[in-house]
């Protein structure tokens, strides 16, 4: 009831609280001389389902039949109108429409490590929109029954608070859930276990790692358990993979040698237990440990290339270029590379440990036979040395490749391709593809880049350290014992028309002919490999069209003659670049008038 | 250190109910498990009911469906509700504390709080 019905009562039959789709009787009457004041006659008693009207009658009593309620609470207020008065409320019900408790499913229970205490789960079923009270019963040895009781709405979990013992852990407990409201109620099935089915270990902890004599093939992994723990799982992985690597193991006593470890790798280590082979669950899985194994000597050899350099006619220069070991060669931090030079008939040796850098340039006599070794080292030992005899890698005219070319493939790649030598192609022992941006200096601080091809290969698809719109210079060497032939070609991945002309920077006049120089086109506006320079010229202030003259395009060039112009006229003169995109813009132009005679 | 006084307790007649009570001072009151036992002119101590941190309670066979134990962890309070009170009831009834809840609470040497006891009788 609401309010303090001074003025009447409401009735509710059979009660308040109803199962869905039952009817109910709602009475609302006034008490003794509570009507309106003078005409008890003129009483209009009013029923509201919340805020709406529902029915109404004259007199001191109103009957009620009510069907169709919703799931829920559902409010009812009865009033008294009166002649030129506001509704008077007389009394008020809440009608509560739920169902019975469906049986509560699938009863479990857990105790979480040997030290917790038991909880147990169900699920409810569909909610029956009244108050339901839920009673937990936990029956076992010595004739013992626990019960908890639990009020909240949505109740689908209780914790008894009790600590189960392995004194007898085959001894058998049932727990059973009853749910009840005012409507029915209903008990799960009895759930039955022991002890070991429902304990569940906590994790292992205190995770540590051991490396004996710091090396990766002796490694201990310690972990401290549950006292009763008898199984354990072990997962490992390195830092940066997705895929765990698992053992399981018995009556481990916390501890495992783990044997597959990679030198120099950080893992994550997780354990999780469980007390019995085939009762019970496992814990969760522990923190994880990082840790790094320690170091080993490295494995694997570098890949050592070179370049020779003419100085002058006692000298040349060496330079010495070899790619950084794998992480899986290395094993370990590489602290430097060792150098060793060696004269192979006079016996005279250099050795320089190189740190930061992965080449080595020194100049040497012309004469004399040379070889070098190169190593990696980390803190554990030095990788084997990779031997290289110095020689002139492009001597053997019969090894060179032929048909050499580069074309584009897809972005940022170049496929190379190439014919055998002439010589006996079965003497090819390896072949080399060697890149390098194309610098018209000839600079040998640009990178070098480099791959090994085996002997029946004819094509390489280069792509690393390729860039849109540059040139490369790329060799093939074809490499047999102490010889060695090599043929050239430009290449790019990609590449348009250049960004600009080359700039004429002088014009000089030589026995009736001129001799145009010009600046090279920077790199960065080059936009690839340049096929051709043109030169036009045509007569100042005429309409004319230009004459030119197409130059194939070498790297070290930059002057050129032209011989058709005649003297006393004044020409304009400016030039243009050409890639297999397209020509670029004009250069600068310049004026020039022949001083020599005419024929 | 936790103190434990019981209240309650005196003379009823057969069939009559009584409320027994028991004030623990000290703090964690809400983590222990407390107890009921009794014992009986020139008999041994035995279990009568018990109730975890939690809320479950159990009681003995003599007593199950008569009395009842709950308890108030706002006011550090251990109630016994008698019912039907037989002859066989009298006894000293006293209110136990252990910090563990184990499955069997009627071992009477994990507790390690005790009270002085209060006199139950029920005469004929």
């Known amino acids: 009831k609401i309010d303090a019905c001074k003025r009447g009562d409401v009735t509710v039959k059979p009660s308040h609280v109803i199962l869905l789709g039952s009817t109910v009787n709602i009475t609302c009457s006034l008490k003794p001389r509570q009507g309106c004041f003078h005409y008890s006659r003129r009483n209009k008693l009013i029923l509201y389902k919340f805020d709406r009207r529902i029915n109404f009658h004259h007199g001191h009593s109103l009957n009620s039949q009510v069907t169709g309620l919703p799931l829920g609470t559902t409010l009812f207020v009865c009033k008294l109108a009166c002649i030129n008065s506001d509704e008077i409320q007389i009394c008020g019900a809440e009608i509560f429409v739920g169902v019975a408790p469906e049986q509560p499913q699938n009863l479990s229970c857990i105790q979480k490590g040997e030290q917790g205490t038991v909880a147990c789960t169900w699920e409810r079923g569909r909610d029956t929109h009244l108050y339901t009270e839920y009673t937990l019963q936990l029956s076992g040895p010595k004739n013992l029954t626990w019960q908890k009781q639990c009020k909240d709405i949505y109740c689908d979990y209780l914790d008894f608070g009790i600590n189960l013992t392995p004194e007898s852990p085959e001894s058998n407990f049932t727990a059973k859930v009853t749910a009840v409201n005012s409507l029915g109620s209903s008990s799960s099935l009895p759930s039955t276990f022991t002890f070991l089915d429902i304990v569940r270990p906590l994790p292992p902890w205190d995770i540590r790692i051991k490396f004996q004599k710091a090396s990766v093939s002796r490694c201990t992994l310690y972990w401290r358990d549950e006292g009763l723990v008898l199984l354990n799982r072990l997962r490992y992985r390195p830092s940066n993979s997705r895929l765990w690597n698992m053992v399981n193991v018995t009556k481990a006593k916390g501890r495992h040698d783990l044997l597959d470890l990679k030198p120099f790798t950080e893992y994550e280590f997780q354990i999780s237990s469980k007390l019995h082979l085939y009762k019970g669950s496992w814990s969760d899985w522990s923190e994880s440990l990082r840790a790094q194994t320690p170091e080993e000597e490295p494995t694997g050899m570098l890949d050592v290339w070179y370049m020779k350099r003419h100085i002058d006619y006692s000298r040349q220069q060496i330079s010495l270029f070899w790619k950084n070991l794998s992480v899986s060669e290395a094993r370990g931090k590489i602290l430097h590379y060792q150098v060793t030079l060696q004269e192979l008939t006079g016996g005279k040796a250099m050795t320089q440990n190189i740190t930061g850098h992965t080449s080595w340039t020194t100049v040497i006599p012309r004469t004399g036979n040379w070889a070098v070794a190169v190593s990696a080292a980390n803190s554990k030992g030095s990788s084997l040395p990779t031997r290289i005899n110095i020689m002139n890698l492009c001597e053997a005219g019969l090894l060179a490749p032929r048909q050499v070319s580069a074309n584009s493939e897809g972005m940022d790649n170049i496929l190379v391709t190439w014919q055998p030598p002439r010589k006996d192609p079965s003497a090819v022992q390896e072949y080399v593809v060697e890149w390098r941006e194309l610098h018209p200096g000839g600079d040998t601080q640009v990178p070098l880049n480099w791959l090994r091809s085996r002997p029946y290969n004819v094509s390489a698809l280069i792509s690393e350290n390729i860039k849109s719109y540059i040139c490369y210079e790329i060799r093939v060497y074809a490499l047999s014992g102490d010889q060695g032939g090599c043929s050239s070609i430009l290449g790019n991945s990609k590449h348009k028309a250049p960004l600009s002309g080359p700039h004429i920077n002088a014009i000089t006049e030589e026995k009736g002919s001129i001799l145009i120089s010009w600046n090279s086109i920077p790199v960065q506006e080059q936009m690839g490999c340049l096929l051709h320079y043109r030169i036009y010229w045509k007569e100042r202030d005429s309409n004319s069209q230009p004459q030119l003259c197409e130059i194939p395009y070498r790297v070290s060039q930059n002057s050129h003659p032209i011989n058709s112009l005649q003297p006393r006229v004044t020409y304009v003169l400016w030039m243009t670049a050409l890639t297999a995109a397209g020509e670029s813009s004009h250069g600068n132009e310049r004026e020039f008038c022949l001083q020599g005679k005419a024929n | 250190q936790v103190q434990l006084v019981e209240s309650g307790g005196g003379l009823v007649q057969l069939g009559d109910s009584l409320r027994l009570s028991c004030a623990a001072s000290?703090?964690?009151?809400?983590?222990?498990?407390m107890a009921w036992f009794r014992q009986a002119l020139g008999k041994r101590r035995e279990f009568v009911a018990a109730?975890?941190?939690?809320?479950?309670?159990t009681c003995s066979a003599e007593s199950e469906g008569r009395f009842t134990i709950s308890r108030d962890n706002a006011k550090n309070m251990v109630f016994l509700q008698m019912n039907s009170l037989k002859a066989e009831d009298t006894a000293v009834y006293y209110c136990?504390?252990?910090?563990?809840?184990?499955?069997?609470?009627?071992?009477?040497?994990?507790?390690?709080?005790w009270g002085q006891g209060t006199q139950v009788t029920v005469s004929s």
């Open positions: 136990a504390a252990t910090g563990i809840a184990s499955w069997d609470p009627g071992m009477a040497d994990k507790y390690t709080y």
């Open positions: 000290g703090r964690g009151f809400s983590s222990w498990t």
């Open positions: 109730i975890t941190a939690t809320g479950a309670r």
